[in-house]
């Protein structure tokens, strides 16, 4: 996961006129036992904020050691601090656990900036505000790290919820969620409601604040409004999806849709920003500037380096456009759109100068690894990771920040043709061609 922080193009794509609508096949998905309803014990089990990640309380070992663990849908390792570190209040002490088993194997995970390394083992793991089960899971005990832990974030480890294909050191290391599903009757599905505060939180407020919910094994109707719309998981590695169209205030960016997914598009709770491929980012910023009276704002603002501030309570949300991403639907030639507000893509930050100002960072940034739908997107929606049916669902979050004029939205269906062509096929290294 990126913590925030050359292709064959098809021309003339853009789908049919988006006024054309297809009938919904059914109004609701059929009920499946244990998958829907109320999960009271799991609601409000996340804390944190988009800039530093959302975390859930977990226990590891026997007797149980309590740790706060970052929820990360953009990686696949369960890894926890296991040695003293200046930014950690506590860490996993393997020697105190009677159920710890050493796998006698190391793991090294480099990021664009920073890295962690550790020793692999297994132990008993449970989630106090989750399903009432205990599982034996792989754990990477982090013994050394650089620019990984965040000062003041209040989490001590990371729960990678993506698929085994991207696990380190290789795909033979079973991820936590796979172990959970295999060892228990928990359905192969989880859902996330990340609640952005809409205003900066100081340290004590973060500790006291509720950050949202991770519902393990189901869908809680109280966490969203309207209907859930599903997009296929293109490939089970990251949670990869396909974006088929992008609009700024209803104006189509009119790019070849392959550009939107170059070289992939993923849903990643461990990334702060909405990250866009370079060409798409440049076009989007140009369009955002044109749609608002912000064209003369300093370049540093659009690069996410410089804050913009307004007198407290006077942020002019209406001068900024809404952003819509159209996602491939479950039905042939059908798409739906998710729409976020500036309340999602302008991230509140603490401005130490004055409490008279509300200050924000532009939380859309450029990427060289494809589109990353990070926390700023997810904070608008209740997101269902339906692994059993290889799809991701979006509905308007009951906790998203909005104003009296506009709200985030999930709408459909829309007619969009040739959506399969929007996916980028990453060249595979064909080992047979390397034979001499």
């Amino acid at each position: 996961t990126q913590h925030g922080i050359r292709l064959p193009l098809r021309s003339g794509l853009g789908g049919a006129p988006l006024g054309l609508r297809l009938p919904r096949e059914t109004d609701e998905e059929p009920e499946e036992p244990g998958r829907r309803g109320s999960f009271v014990e799991m609601v409000d089990n996340l804390r944190g904020k988009s800039g530093q990640g959302y975390y859930v309380e977990m226990t590891v070992g026997s007797p149980p050691q309590t740790l706060n663990i970052l929820v990360d849908t953009g990686s696949s390792n369960f890894a926890v601090g296991a040695a003293p570190h200046p930014f950690l209040h506590r860490y996993y002490q393997r020697q105190l656990s009677s159920t710890y088993r050493d796998l006698r194997k190391g793991v090294y995970v480099p990021y664009t900036q920073g890295k962690w390394e550790g020793e692999l083992g297994t132990d008993l793991v449970s989630i106090p505000h989750g399903p009432n089960v205990t599982v034996r899971a792989n754990i990477a005990a982090i013994t050394e790290s650089d620019k990984f832990f965040i000062n003041g974030s209040n989490w001590e480890g990371i729960l990678g919820l993506a698929y085994a294909e991207i696990a380190r050191p290789d795909d033979s290391l079973e991820p936590f969620f796979d172990s959970l599903v295999k060892q228990t009757h928990v359905p192969n599905l989880f859902s996330l409601q990340l609640c952005g505060a809409g205003f900066p939180l100081n340290q004590s407020e973060v500790l006291a604040s509720v950050g949202g919910s991770m519902i393990i094994g189901g869908i809680d109707h109280s966490l969203y409004t309207g209907s859930l719309w599903y997009t296929p998981i293109r490939r089970e590695w990251y949670y990869e999806v396909i974006i088929v169209r992008v609009e700024i205030n209803g104006q189509d960016l009119k790019m070849d849709c392959k550009e939107y997914n170059y070289d992939k598009s993923i849903v990643d709770s461990g990334t702060t920003n909405l990250r866009l491929p370079k060409k798409v980012f440049e076009a989007a910023v140009k369009s955002i500037k044109a749609a608002s009276s912000t064209e003369k704002f300093p370049d540093g603002f659009w690069l996410g380096e410089q804050l913009v501030c307004w007198q407290a309570g006077t942020t002019p949300w209406n001068i900024f456009p809404v952003i819509s991403l159209y996602l491939m639907g479950e039905v042939t030639n059908q798409s739906f759109r998710i729409t976020i507000l500036p309340q999602q893509y302008l991230r509140p930050v603490e401005d130490v100068a004055t409490s008279q100002d509300d200050c924000y960072k532009f939380a859309i940034s450029q990427s060289s690894t494809g589109t990353v739908m990070g926390a700023v997107i997810m904070e608008g929606f209740y997101v269902v990771f339906d692994r059993a049916r290889k799809r991701i669902g979006f509905a308007v979050s009951a906790c998203h920040v909005h104003d009296e004029f506009r709200t985030a939205a999930v709408e459909g269906p829309f007619v969009t043709l040739d959506m399969e062509d929007c996916g980028y096929n990453i060249p595979q290294t064909d080992e047979s061609t390397l034979m001499t």
Epitope: S293, K296, F297, P298, V308, W310, Q311, T314, I319
Partner: nanobody, 125 residues
Framework: DVQLQESGGGSVQAGGSLRLSCAAS????????FAWLRQAPGKDREVVAV?????????FYSDSVNGRFTISQDTAKNTVYLQMNSLEPEDTAMYFC?????????????????WGQGTQVTVSS
């Protein structure tokens, strides 16, 4: 034309505060931004804070003053202010108010068309 007149400079101890004012007159409604710049002896002019009336008073700060200085405006009085807290000896400079209606972004001094005469700020340790 636009005329700009600064006031409020002076001498202060490190850690102290000052509030600078910039009274604007003339065709101020055509200006899309006002800025406070400073020039220390032997150094280039630098923009320290910008305010955009056309974007409902959006404000930006340079890294060197962010968290210590606050720019604000009183549109009824056609005045722009710079509240300077936690002053440091490195803040010693001539401070200028400037305004512009052109298309350059806010942190290039060359992008400003109209300038005041300046007001001196001296911070001693």
């Amino acid at each position: 034309d636009v005329q700009l007149q600064e006031s409020g400079g002076g001498s202060v101890q490190a850690g102290g505060s000052l509030r600078l004012s910039c009274a604007a007159s003339g065709y101020t409604s055509e200006m899309n931004r006002f800025a406070w710049l400073r020039q220390a002896p032997g150094k280039d002019r630098e923009v320290v804070a910008v305010i955009f009336p056309t974007a409902r008073g959006a404000k930006f700060y340079s890294d060197s003053v962010n968290g210590r200085f606050t720019i604000s405006q009183d549109t009824a009085k056609n005045t722009v202010y710079l509240q300077m807290n936690s002053l440091e000896p490195e803040d010693t400079a001539m401070y200028f108010c400037a305004a512009s209606a052109n298309a350059m972004t806010g942190f290039q001094p060359s992008g400003y068309t109209y300038w005041g005469q300046g007001t001196q700020v001296t911070v001693s340790s």
